[in-house]
């Protein structure tokens, strides 16, 4: 669904300030595209609220309109509040707008609970915190909508930012990344560092923090330490992936490698938990059960419903354990694998219980529609999403949470053969690459 | 069927220690299936929830009484039992203990509770 | 905090008619929400599990309704041993340990 599982998502607070970060490893990776080393006027430009979406500031129209637009990578719509709705504070007037050009054309985009519809035109956008460019790209102006917007969220709008494949209404709409490397000199490649706060937040920390970075155009080395491992983009459309294994703290789920790929498996910033499809969902919750088995949580938690409380600071973390995720490499029958802890897959719900307490939820859901890799993998790493060389890069976050026993990890490499076989093909039949919900 | 029995003393005096057990009849404490707990009610109030136990030993406790609360058990006894220190008037109150099923979520087994009487 | 308000305080009606008691959650519960009934100088007994389902033993006469923050426990048609104190409580925060304030239903 639209709400509480794709979106609302979370953020929280960011890693120590950049002159605390831990320093990057050297490594002998081969060169990349993009300037390389400091983004600085990039660093820090996202935000958010715990569950509500990582949102960076955009400016829209002559004179620039400023509004906060939800970062999302498993969509392809620039899309954005184009009316009043109770839940905008604000919202883009094409009227004002002297370079708004009408496409003459609706956008209609349902999802499996909720949906939004609007106008087809383009504008000038800039990203102020982001390169120096202003660039002509579509926009869809969103006229009505169902549980689309959220209450308290403070973003008005969302950046699709995955291939042309899946925009709406088809794949002719250009979306904005395309546009943008189109018109400047832009390398295409860009990278998120998504900052979860690990503690539940008051309202007030809520408001004020900050959630990451997206750097666009290159890689930051001080936003990860250690070294970048790659896996292919199997195909330009979402940014899917292949696992070719799955571990929780070490043991092998053991499952046929095409299981975990059913019916794809992306890369999306914008869905909050780790999605895994039925059968894999199943057997990872019975693995992760076994191995918390000296505490025993109720069958909502595991659903994703109930939250289960401890005293403040008191999480017993160490009962939880790790998840990897392996993914196949760029190497021939070569593997590299994202390790995440409970700091990760538990998400801080605030307001809920009473301040003595620290609340969470189980941020690992059963999918339909495949694996998605949303904020509970994400928050661990930084992701460099390399459009120039269709490959997604994974380095341990340096603001990832963790504590002094564990911290995620990125390891390899590891051999694994006959990974081209857990790549699951959607017969041509099959309508579910129309499928805009991602129940 | 399963039955649950609290027993200890009626009457505690002021800044002294509560302590009562409650008896698990017709089943296993041990069953892998329950949580147990424990629940008050002053005379004439609502209801209270003090604390759970699973049989392995893990706890949670209401946390404007976990600095006085102790609630342990012993699977040999079939028994799980509860201890609250420096008692108060504020104390004073039918305690019940009771089990957590339905996925761990509803008490939906209670024992008949007792009076304790935190008094001088 | 969840806060779990229960209205009315004081329900009187005479013995056949319909009893309807609310409980309203400060914020969002979900479904995850018990009723108990309990009888003086008894323990309370479970009704109600995940807002709408009889736990074992219970009469069909109880029944539960409601998601998200208003509930609602309605006796179709009461019964003499029906008279007593009715208790909600949410379990959507676990450990579960917020009741409401009770409803007692009276012999009018």
């Known amino acids: 669904t639209h709400l509480g599982i794709r979106l609302p998502l979370r953020s929280g607070l960011a890693g120590p300030p950049l002159g605390l970060r831990l320093p990057r490893e050297t490594d002998e990776e081969s060169e990349e595209p993009g300037r390389r080393g400091s983004f600085v006027e990039m660093v820090d430009n996202l935000r958010g609220k715990s569950g509500q979406g990582y949102y960076v500031e955009m400016t829209v129209g002559s004179p620039p309109q400023t509004l906060n637009i939800l970062v999302d990578t498993g969509s392809s719509n620039f899309a954005v509040g184009a009316a009043p709705h109770p839940f905008l504070h604000r919202y883009y007037q094409r009227q004002l707008s002297s370079t708004y050009r009408d496409l003459r054309k609706g956008v209609y985009v349902p999802y499996t609970q909720g949906k939004w519809e609007g106008e087809l035109g383009t504008d000038l956008v800039s990203i102020p915190h982001g390169p120096n460019v202003t660039v002509r790209a579509n926009i869809a102006a969103i006229t009505e909508s169902d549980k689309f917007f959220i209450n308290g969220s403070n973003w008005e709008g969302i950046l699709g930012l995955a291939y042309a494949e899946i925009a709406r209404p088809d794949d002719s709409l250009e979306p904005f990344f395309d546009s943008l490397v189109k018109q400047t000199h832009i390398p295409n490649i860009f990278s998120l560092q998504l900052c979860g706060a690990g503690f539940p937040l008051n309202q007030t920390e809520a408001l004020a923090s900050v959630g990451g970075s997206m750097i666009i155009g290159g890689i930051d080395h001080s936003l990860y330490t250690g070294r970048l491992w790659y896996t292919p983009i199997r195909r330009e459309w979402y940014y899917e992936v292949i696992i070719v294994r799955v571990e929780i703290n070490g043991q092998d789920l053991k499952m046929d490698c095409k299981e975990y790929n059913y019916d794809k498996s992306i890369v999306d910033s914008g869905t909050t938990n780790l999605r895994l499809p039925k059968k894999v969902f199943e057997a990872a919750v019975k693995s992760i059960k076994a191995a918390s088995s000296t505490e025993k949580f109720p069958d909502g938690f595991w659903l994703g419903e109930q939250l289960v409380c401890w005293q403040a600071g008191t999480t017993p973390w160490n009962i939880f354990p790790v998840i990897s995720l392996y993914l196949m490499g760029e190497v021939t029958n070569q593997s590299f694998r994202i390790t995440i802890l409970p700091q990760q897959y538990l998400r801080p719900v605030e307001d809920v219980a009473t301040s003595q307490d620290d609340c969470y939820k189980f941020a690992v859901s059963q999918s339909s529609t495949g694996t998605v890799m949303g904020a509970v993998i994400m928050e661990g790493f930084y992701v460099v999403f390399d459009r120039a060389r269709k490959r997604i890069g994974f380095a341990v976050s340096a603001c990832h949470v963790h504590d002094e026993f564990r911290t995620a990890a990125v390891e390899g490499p590891f051999v694994t053969a006959d990974m081209e076989d857990c790549g699951y093909n959607i017969p041509q039949t099959d309508e579910s690459t129309l499928m805009t919900g991602r129940a | 069927q399963l039955q649950l029995q609290e027993s200890g003393p009626g009457l505690v005096k002021p800044s002294e220690t509560l302590s009562l057990t409650c008896t698990v009849s017709?089943?296993?404490?041990?069953?892998?299936?329950?949580?147990w707990g424990w629940i008050r009610q002053p005379p004439g109030k609502g209801l209270e929830w003090i604390g759970n136990?699973?049989?392995?030993?893990?706890?949670y406790y209401n946390p404007s009484l976990k600095s006085r609360v102790t609630i342990s058990v012993d699977t040999s006894k079939n028994q799980f039992s509860l201890k609250l220190s420096s008692v108060t008037a504020a104390d004073t109150a039918v305690y019940y203990c009771?089990?957590?099923?339905?996925?761990?979520?509803?008490?939906?087994?209670w024992g008949r509770g007792t009076l304790v009487t935190v008094s001088s | 905090e969840i806060v779990l308000t229960q209205s009315p305080a004081t329900l009187s009606l005479s013995p056949g008619e319909r009893a309807t008691l609310s409980c309203r959650a400060s914020q969002s519960v979900s479904s995850y929400l018990a009723w108990f009934q309990q009888k003086p100088g008894q323990a309370p007994r479970l009704l109600i599990y995940d807002a709408s389902n009889r736990a074992t033993g219970i009469p069909a006469r109880f029944s539960g309704s409601g998601s998200g923050t208003d509930f609602t426990l309605t006796i179709s048609s009461l019964e003499p041993e029906d008279f007593a104190v009715y208790y909600c409580q949410q379990v959507y925060v676990w450990p579960p340990r917020t009741f409401g304030g009770g409803t007692k239903v009276e012999i009018k």
């Open positions: 017709g089943g296993s404490i041990s069953s892998s299936s329950y949580y």
């Open positions: 009771a089990r957590l099923g339905h996925g761990y979520s509803y008490f939906d087994l």
């Open positions: 136990i699973y049989y392995s030993g893990s706890t």
